[in-house]
Amino acid sequence: APVRSLNCTLRDSQQKSLVMSGPYELKALHLQGQDMEQQVVFSMSFVQGEESNDKIPVALGLKEKNLYLSCVLKDDKPTLQLESVDPKNYPKKKMEKRFVFNKIEINNKLEFESAQFPNWYISTSQAENMPVFLGGTKGGQDITDFTMQFVSS
């Protein structure tokens, strides 16, 4: 059965946009004007996972690329990566757990919690031009709040 998806961009709560940094990494930085075209467009798919009024399980693929954000252990630490997949098989309604994020809406802001590693969140640094990563703390120095902008297909 087809999975429902939408196209969007994400900005952190400091209005930093997400752009590609090499083939398998995202970084966050402030963009203006024509540079806004550099920001990555996600294909957000609604997938199997824990669902409630304020929590929706999603997978975050890069639009028209066979890359998905995924959460894996590297050196015993939960780590965010961009993972290449077979485009014939993805997206699907029931994604592997490492691709699933709980999209949590709080006060018009979004958090993306890893389903594989509860209480670990997609995060950005306060500093400019730093990698997007998986962080294990909320409310500290690192930023875990995002806004979503819809993009027409």
Partner: antibody
Framework: QVQLQQWGAGLLKPSETLSLTCAVY????????WSWIRQPPGKGLEWIGE???????NYNPSLKSRVTISVDTSRNQFSLSLSSVTAADTAVYYC?????????????WGQGTLVTVSS | QSVLTQPPSVSVSPGQTASITCSGD??????AFWYQQKPGQSPVLVIY???KRPSGIPERFSGSNSGNTATLTISGTQALDEADYYC?????????FGGGTKLTVLG
Amino acid sequence: QVQLQQWGAGLLKPSETLSLTCAVYGGSFSDYYWSWIRQPPGKGLEWIGEIDHSGSTNYNPSLKSRVTISVDTSRNQFSLSLSSVTAADTAVYYCARASPSSGWTLDYWGQGTLVTVSS
Amino acid sequence: QSVLTQPPSVSVSPGQTASITCSGDKLGDKFAFWYQQKPGQSPVLVIYLDNKRPSGIPERFSGSNSGNTATLTISGTQALDEADYYCQAWADSFEVFGGGTKLTVLG
């Protein structure tokens, strides 16, 4: 309270087509997937397939060539058809609901229908 | 075709902890579900998404899933927990059930 009520022929001859229908009472029909599962006597569960309100289906590859699951949203019903049955298809057949709030798994089941294939 | 392997039977004394395992290749990267089935009855969902309990399921039921093994744990097992238990997970495009485990509560 959600209820799934199922019915269909309980005794078939080899090579005939099994037909079962499941009616859903209570709750929305369009927000869920609707599944069929079977259980041969004294054995384990086997997933047959699922359908959503739009008619989109997934089937167990081992049964795919013989199975059709259909839906009638106007009656809140869905049906199972299994062609060319043999004695190996003798089982209790269950209909069930797959719900997003439980991770798209089977949270409500019908009462089961025993289907016997015998010449 | 994906395979989920369960022990055919597990025995436990009343009040003790019962653990039922379900093994499959990279099962920890999928979501695992558990059903309880008593004789002559339809299955009942007892654990979903690895470790969550549906409303009405007692707190003594818990689940975990990592590596290649999902585990259903029943702490303070009661006589009424005697039943068959089935694990389930999603393969590439279809659902797969384990072969089932008969839980016997001794005494």
